[in-house]
C-alpha cells in the first residue's frame, strides 16, 4: 500500500511540477503535508534556476549532479539521496517524510552511523573480553598479546610462550628460567651470564672493591681477608676489617732499672768492658728473677779469651763454669731460684776461691789456684756479657747449655763499680726494660711466632703419626692462631685458632685443615684471669677434643676427607708454629692473626720450651707472662 502511495505521489509531482511549473500551493497538493512541502519547494526553485532556458549549458558545466530538470526535481523528496549516512558505518538508509533513518553496521552508532563504538571500553564486556590488549578499530576491534605471549585460537586469550621449552639451547650452558612474557638465563651465585658466549662467567668481585683489605676471587665467589699480622680481623659483614681488640688487659708496666735478659732470642743483651787496676778481682752482685730453669746470666772473659767465667742457671739452680790457665771447673749448687721471686746473687773472686752467695748466704765456694783473670801491663781487662756469650765460646764450654734465659736483673754491681753508665744505656732502650710483675708461663704479644721441628711419626702406632696437644691458655685478645702445622708448599694442614664469638664476651676455638674449619667449639669464656685447659688428639682416622665443658670425638661427613688432606701433609714434612703463622698466603687459613696472651703447650707428652725453638720472635717471652691488669681505685 505504501509503495502505491509513493507511485501516485511521483506521478502527481511529474505532472504538476515538471511538465508544468508549480507554485507552493500546487506542491502542497502533491505532498499533502507541510513538512515535505517546506522541504521540497526551496530545493525545487533551485532546480528551476539551474535548468531555465539560457542557463542550461552553464548548469551542465556547474557542480549540479543532475542531467536535466526531471532528475533534479525527482531527487528532492528522497531523503537518502544524496546519502546522508556515513558510508563506512551504515548498512541501509530509509527515506522518511523529510527525514531519513540510517541503519548501522555492528560496531557503529549515531544518527548517520558516523560514530565508531569502542568495544574495548564496553563496561559490560571488560577490555572487549581480551586477556591482554584490546585494539579498537573503526567499526570493530581485535585482541592482541604483549611480547612473549601468543594468542589462543579463541582470539581473546594470551598464553605465555615458554621460550625455555621452545628453544632448549637458548641459554647455552646456563639454566633457562621461563617468566611471564620472557625468560632468564640463570647462573649460580657468583656467576654472571654472558650473552655473547651463552655461558656463565665468574664474577670477579675483587675488581669491584668488595673487600677492605685483601680479596681472593675464586670460581663462584670471593673471600675477604684482613692482615692479622697487623692486628686486623674480618668484621661480621665479612668484608670490612676491624682491629683485634683486647679482651683481657695485661699489666705491661716496665722499669728501666730492671734489665730484661731475653731481649734477643739469640745474642747478648748487654756487653761491658772493664779496665781496672791489676789488684782488682772479679765480682758481680745483682738481684735476679726468673721462672726459666736454664740459661746464661752472665759470662766474663779475659781480653785474650784465655780465661772465662760463666754464671748460669741449670735446673733452676746456679751453675758456675770457669776455665783459665790453671783450672777448668763446673759447679752447680744452692736452692732452686727460678721461683719468680727476686733473689740476691753475688759472685766474688776471693784470693783462693770463688764465693757464690744467694741472699747473702754462701751456697758455693769454688777453689782456684791463682787469679781468675791475669792482669797485663798493670791492668785487669775484663769483658762481661749479660744473658749470653760470644758464639765461639759454645764449643769451649765444659758442659753445653742453652744460653737463652727469660729473666730480669736489678741492682747490679759489677767489678765493684756500681751501675755506673749502664743505667743510662738501658734507660733509652725500651725493649731492655723488664716487666714489673710477671707470672709463670709463656707470653705471646701478638706480634710474632715461634717455630719448632717436631717429628710426629710414631713408628710403633698403626696410625703412623699422631698429634696430641695440650694447651693451657689465658688469651688477651679473642682472635689469633695458637698452633699451626705448616707444609713446605705454604699450606697449613692443621691449625688451632681462637676467634671472637658472635655471642658477647666469648670466644670460639677453630680447628682447621687448610682453609676449611673442620670443627668449631663455640662460646667459651676464655678471656678470664684463669687459665683454660684444652686438649686435642688427631691422627689420620680420628679427631678428639677436650675442653673445660666437654670431651668428644668429632665425626662428620667431611671430616674423613679433611683428615686425608692432613694425613698426606703429615707423611711429608711439617713445621710446627706457635702463636701464629709464618709468611703463608692470607687465604691459607681461616684465621691469620697472631695469638696474644699466655700459653703453655705440650705436644705428644713433651712440654715445649720456647728457648728450644728453632726460631722465636724476640717479643715472645719464653718463661714469663704479664699479670692481668687490675683496676685500682685511683686509676
Amino acid at each position: 500500500a505504501n509503495s502505491l502511495l509513493e507511485e501516485t505521489k511521483q506521478g502527481n509531482l511529474e505532472r504538476e511540477c515538471i511538465e508544468e511549473l508549480c507554485n507552493k500551493e500546487e506542491a502542497r497538493e502533491v505532498f499533502e503535508n507541510d513538512p515535505e512541502t517546506d522541504y521540497f519547494y526551496p530545493k525545487y526553485l533551485v532546480c528551476l534556476r539551474s535548468f531555465q532556458t539560457g542557463l542550461f549549458t552553464a548548469a551542465r558545466q556547474s557542480t549540479n549532479a543532475y542531467p536535466d530538470l526531471r532528475s533534479c526535481v525527482n531527487a528532492i523528496p528522497d531523503q537518502c539521496s544524496p546519502l546522508p549516512c556515513n558510508e563506512d558505518g551504515y548498512m541501509s538508509c530509509k527515506d522518511g517524510k523529510a527525514s531519513f533513518t540510517c541503519t548501522c553496521k555492528p560496531g557503529w552508532q549515531g544518527e548517520k552511523c558516523e560514530f565508531d563504538i569502542n568495544e574495548c571500553k564496553d563496561p559490560s564486556n571488560i577490555n572487549g573480553g581480551c586477556s591482554q590488549i584490546c585494539d579498537n578499530t573503526p567499526g570493530s576491534y581485535h585482541c592482541s598479546c604483549k611480547n612473549g605471549f601468543v594468542m589462543l585460537s579463541n582470539k581473546k586469550d594470551c598464553k605465555d610462550v615458554d621460550e625455555c621449552s621452545l628453544k632448549p639451547s637458548i641459554c647455552g650452558t646456563a639454566v633457562c628460567k621461563n617468566i611471564p612474557g620472557d625468560f632468564e638465563c640463570e647462573c649460580p651465585e657468583g656467576y654472571r651470564y654472558n650473552l655473547k658466549s651463552k655461558s656463565c662467567e665468574d664474577i670477579d668481585e675483587c675488581s669491584e672493591n668488595m673487600c677492605a683489605q685483601l680479596c681472593v676471587n675464586y670460581p663462584g665467589g670471593y673471600t675477604c681477608y684482613c692482615d692479622g699480622k697487623k692486628g686486623f680481623k674480618l668484621a661480621q659483614d665479612q668484608k670490612s676489617c676491624e682491629v683485634v681488640s683486647v679482651c683481657l688487659p695485661l699489666n705491661l708496666d716496665t722499669k728501666y732499672e730492671l734489665l730484661y735478659l731475653a731481649e734477643q732470642f739469640a745474642g747478648v743483651v748487654l756487653y761491658l768492658k772493664f779496665r781496672l787496676p791489676e789488684i782488682s778481682r772479679f765480682s758481680a752482685e745483682f738481684d735476679f728473677r726468673t721462672y726459666d730453669s736454664e740459661g746464661v746470666i752472665l759470662y766474663a772473659e779475659s781480653i785474650d779469651h784465655s780465661a772465662w767465667l760463666l754464671i748460669a742457671l741449670r735446673g733452676g739452680k746456679i751453675e758456675v763454669q770457669l776455665k783459665n790457665e790453671h783450672t777448668s771447673k763446673i759447679t752447680t749448687g744452692g736452692d732452686v731460684i727460678n721461683n719468680g721471686l727476686w733473689n740476691m746473687v753475688s759472685v766474688e773472686e776471693l784470693e783462693h776461691s770463688i764465693s757464690i752467695k744467694i741472699a747473702k748466704e754462701a751456697v758455693m765456694d769454688i777453689n782456684k789456684p791463682g787469679p781468675l783473670f791475669k792482669p797485663e801491663n798493670g791492668l785487669l781487662e775484663t769483658k762481661v756479657y749479660f744473658a749470653g756469650f760470644p758464639r765461639k765460646v759454645e764449643s769451649e764450654l765444659i758442659k753445653p747449655i742453652n744460653p737463652r734465659l727469660d729473666g730480669c736483673i736489678r741492682s747490679w754491681n759489677l767489678m765493684k763499680q756500681g751501675a755506673s753508665g749502664i743505667k743510662e744505656i738501658i734507660q733509652e732502650k725500651q725493649n731492655k726494660h723488664c716487666l714489673v710483675t710477671v707470672e709463670k708461663g709463656s707470653y705471646y704479644p701478638g706480634s710474632g711466632i715461634a717455630q719448632f721441628h717436631i717429628d710426629y711419626n710414631n713408628v710403633s702406632s698403626a696410625e703412623g703419626w699422631h698429634v696430641n696437644v695440650t694447651l693451657n691458655i689465658r688469651p688477651s685478645t679473642g682472635t689469633g692462631v695458637m698452633l699451626a702445622l705448616v707444609s713446605g708448599n705454604n699450606t697449613v694442614p692443621f691449625a688451632v685458632s681462637l676467634v671472637d664469638s658472635t655471642s658477647e664476651k666469648s670466644q670460639d676455638i677453630l680447628l682447621s685443615v687448610e682453609n676449611t674449619v673442620i670443627y668449631r667449639i663455640q662460646a667459651l669464656s676464655l678471656c678470664s684471669d684463669q687459665q683454660s685447659h684444652l686438649e686435642f688428639r688427631v691422627n689420620r682416622n680420628n679427631l678428639e677434643l677436650s675442653t673445660p665443658l666437654k670431651i668428644e670425638t668429632i665425626s662428620h661427613e667431611d671430616l674423613q676427607r679433611q683428615l686425608a688432606v692432613l694425613d698426606k701433609a703429615m707423611k711429608a714434612k711439617v713445621a710446627t708454629y706457635l702463636g701464629g703463622l709464618p709468611d703463608v698466603p692470607f687465604s691459607a687459613t681461616p684465621v691469620n692473626a697472631f695469638y696474644n696472651g699466655c700459653m703453655e703447650v705440650n705436644i705428644n707428652g713433651v712440654q715445649l720450651d720456647l728457648d728450644e725453638a728453632i726460631s722465636k720472635h724476640n717479643d715472645i717471652r719464653a718463661h714469663s707472662c704479664p699479670s692481668v691488669w687490675k683496676k685500682t681505685k685511683n686509676s
Partner: antibody, heavy 119, light 106 residues
Framework: EVKLEESGGGLVQPGGSMKLSCAAS????????MDWVRQSPEKGLEWVAE??????????YYAESVKGRFTISRDDSKSAVYLQMNSLRPEDTGIYYC??????????WGQGTTLTVSS | QIALTQSPAIMSASPGEKVTMTCSVN?????MHWYQQKPGSSPRLWIY???NLVSGVPGRFSGSGSGTSYSLTLSSMEAEDAATYYC?????????FGGGTKLEIK
C-alpha cells in the same frame, strides 16, 4: 572459528595399518603446530605425536609408546594433518583427537575419530 | 619421565559447595594446564598457565600451584560444572596428562 575434523578411524586387526586425517580451517594452518591425542578408558588422555610448523622445520615428536610405528605428517597446501599407524596393537584402541597446539597446550580439539584394534 | 597424579579420582559436590582437586608432579614443572571434558564431547582447554581462565570460563573457577603441586578450585559448585577435569604439562619434548578427576553433582 577454528574447525578440526578427523576421519579415517575404524576397525583394524592387530599388526594392521591405518591412516587418520584431520582437515583444518579457521586459522593460518601453515603457522600452527598440530598434534594427535588419544583417549581410552584404560589409559585416559594420552599424547601421541606432534608436527611443528614450517618455521620449525616441520619437526616431529612422538610418545615413547608409538615411536617407530606411527608417523605424523602435514600438507600445508591442503590444511591437513595425518597420522600413519603401522603395527597396530590392541592398546592403540581409543578415540583419536586432532588438536591445534599453541605454546605447549592443546588449544582446540576436533570431535575425534575412533580406532578399534581387535581380531 | 614426568608423571601427573590427580586426586581424588572421583568426587561429588552439592550445589554451592566449594571443590578443590589436586595434580601432583613427580618433578618440578613451570606451568600446569587444565581441561574440562563432558561425556560425549571433546576435552576443552579450561585453565592455562596454572591460573589463567580461558575466555568464557566462569569466574568461580581458579587455578594455583607451583613446582610439584597444583590445584583447581571451584568456589561454588553448579550443575553445569559436572565433568571430568584433566591436568596437563609439557617438559622435554613430551606432553603428559593426569588421570583425571570426575566431578559429579550430588
Amino acid at each position: 572459528e577454528v574447525k578440526l575434523e578427523e576421519s579415517g578411524g575404524g576397525l583394524v586387526q592387530p599388526g594392521g595399518s591405518m591412516k587418520l586425517s584431520c582437515a583444518a580451517s579457521g586459522f593460518t594452518f601453515s603457522d600452527a603446530w598440530m598434534d594427535w591425542v588419544r583417549q581410552s578408558p584404560e589409559k585416559g588422555l594420552e599424547w601421541v605425536a606432534e608436527v611443528r610448523s614450517k618455521a620449525d622445520n616441520h619437526a616431529t615428536y612422538y610418545a615413547e609408546s608409538v615411536k617407530g610405528r606411527f608417523t605424523i605428517s602435514r600438507d600445508d597446501s591442503k590444511s591437513a594433518v595425518y597420522l600413519q599407524m603401522n603395527s597396530l596393537r590392541p592398546e592403540d584402541t581409543g578415540i583419536y583427537y586432532c588438536t591445534l597446539t599453541t605454546a605447549f597446550l592443546f588449544d582446540s580439539w576436533g570431535q575425534g575419530t575412533t580406532l578399534t584394534v581387535s581380531s | 619421565q614426568i608423571a601427573l597424579t590427580q586426586s581424588p579420582a572421583i568426587m561429588s559436590a552439592s550445589p554451592g559447595e566449594k571443590v578443590t582437586m589436586t595434580c601432583s608432579v613427580n618433578s618440578s614443572v613451570s606451568y600446569m594446564h587444565w581441561y574440562q571434558q563432558k561425556p560425549g564431547s571433546s576435552p576443552r582447554l579450561w585453565i592455562y598457565d596454572t591460573s589463567n581462565l580461558v575466555s568464557g570460563v566462569p569466574g568461580r573457577f581458579s587455578g594455583s600451584g607451583s613446582g610439584t603441586s597444583y590445584s583447581l578450585t571451584l568456589s561454588s559448585m553448579e550443575a553445569e560444572d559436572a565433568a571430568t577435569y584433566y591436568c596437563q604439562q609439557y617438559s622435554g619434548y613430551l606432553y603428559t596428562f593426569g588421570g583425571g578427576t570426575k566431578l559429579e553433582i550430588k
